[in-house]
Amino acid sequence: ATKLTEEKYELKEGQTLDVKCDYTLEKFASSQKAWQIIRDGEMPKTLACTERPSKNSHPVQVGRIILEDYHDHGLLRVRMVNLQVEDSGLYQCVIYQPPKEPHMLFDRIRLVVTKGFSGTPGSNENSTQNVYKIPPTTTKALCPLYTSPRTVTQAPPKSTADVSTPDSEINLTNVTDIIRVPVFN
């Protein structure tokens, strides 16, 4: 059975969050997709969305967020560049399908951004801040002012979470900790 999970990314200020959300190609290829932040007890807030209809491999930039929808592969890529401490929070990808409620994609992302310069001597992480390139053509898309009460949740208490951490040999650049936590709605 498919489990809605939460993955934790711990990054430093200035680094880039680079994630992907997968969707059912046949159903949602050209649907408009959005990146939302979920604050405890509040409605999810849309921060950026693709065009409508969504264009293939066409980067859309809203501030420090870049969305790229790979239609052919059923993947939405989300990049948040030059991360700030205040970007910390719970995020999710959704697909707009009016008049129905937005369709939530797996997985949710728990982003924790901490102070501290990345890539300093002695650091075992490489910063992507000097590496990231802004796509040559970007479009600012208008997002529907629509949120779904159904997706207002709080993460499960730690005591009930079945936490499985990455294999010990994994060393992800720019990611100090990724923890997968099932979310029970």
Epitope: K3, E7, D22, F106, S164, I170, V175
Partner: antibody
Framework: QVQLVQSGAEVKKPGASVKVSCKAS????????INWVRQATGQGLEWMGW????????GSVKKFRDRVTMTRDTSISTAYMELSSLRSEDTAVYYC????????????????WGQGTLVTVSS | DIQMTQSPSSLSASVGDRVTITCQAS??????LNWYQQKPGKAPKLLIY???NLETGVPSRFSGSGSGTDFTFTISSLQPEDFATYYC?????????FGQGTRLEIK
């Protein structure tokens, strides 16, 4: 430790289909995407596509889109890749591969490889 | 699709030599580049990810550098077990593509 064990070699006639299995162990199967990469004899590596074992969603390159189906059985931690309408140029070793990071990470680094399955297409 | 061009396609060297392989992308791929080693009859093995990060357990004689379109893979002092074929692979966007490979042979 992480292990991906693939099914044995297959010999198929042109026009037939082949289904290669990939049994995962040593990690949480639904937490990491499985990708498929093939290599014709004496040739380079060719990425075919990916599958998220949790959602069941998958995607493949245009070249294979109409002929490839990627599925999984989470109860036995096994991924499958079926290629139909086989032709002689599909003769290759097919590898299932696990990425370095969780399914949500945009990090296509192929860290753990199966031993490969040789598929021979011959009349 | 992004094309990855490796050079040379084959290379003869001796144990102890310093060996360099280059990989050129048809457009800027930032640091989204990996290097693999493959021995005959075996599956490829990830050596370097994100252009310069050494995979856990890989000897430090292997290194990678570069960003944008030009990348370099170096073996500082060739060992007998290093004779193999090496591939670069980008993942700046989808689809993912590999270089055609560089075959490293004993001189």
């Amino acid at each position: 430790q992480v292990q991906l064990v693939q099914s044995g070699a297959e010999v198929k006639k042109p026009g037939a289909s082949v289904k290669v299995s990939c049994k995962a162990s040593g990690y949480t199967f639904t937490s990491y995407d499985i990708n498929w990469v093939r290599q014709a004899t004496g040739q380079g590596l060719e990425w075919m596509g990916w599958m998220n074992p949790n959602s069941g969603n998958s995607g493949s390159v245009k070249k294979f889109r109409d002929r490839v189906t990627m599925t999984r059985d989470t109860s036995i931690s096994t991924a499958y890749m079926e290629l139909s309408s086989l032709r002689s140029e599909d003769t290759a070793v097919y590898y299932c591969v696990r990425l370095i990071g969780y399914s949500s990470a945009y990090k296509w680094s192929f860290q753990h490889w199966g031993q490969g399955t040789l598929v021979t297409v011959s009349s | 699709d992004i094309q990855m061009t490796q050079s040379p396609s084959s290379l003869s060297a001796s144990v102890g030599d310093r060996v360099t392989i280059t990989c050129q992308a048809s457009r800027d791929i930032s640091k989204y580049l990996n290097w693999y080693q493959q021995k005959p009859g075996k599956a490829p093995k990830l050596l370097i990810y994100d252009a310069s990060n050494l995979e856990t357990g890989v000897p430090s004689r292997f290194s990678g550098s570069g960003s944008g379109t030009d990348f370099t893979f170096t073996i500082s002092s060739l060992q007998p077990e290093d004779f193999a074929t090496y591939y670069c692979q980008h993942y700046d966007n989808i689809p993912i593509t590999f270089g055609q490979g560089t075959r490293l042979e004993i001189k």
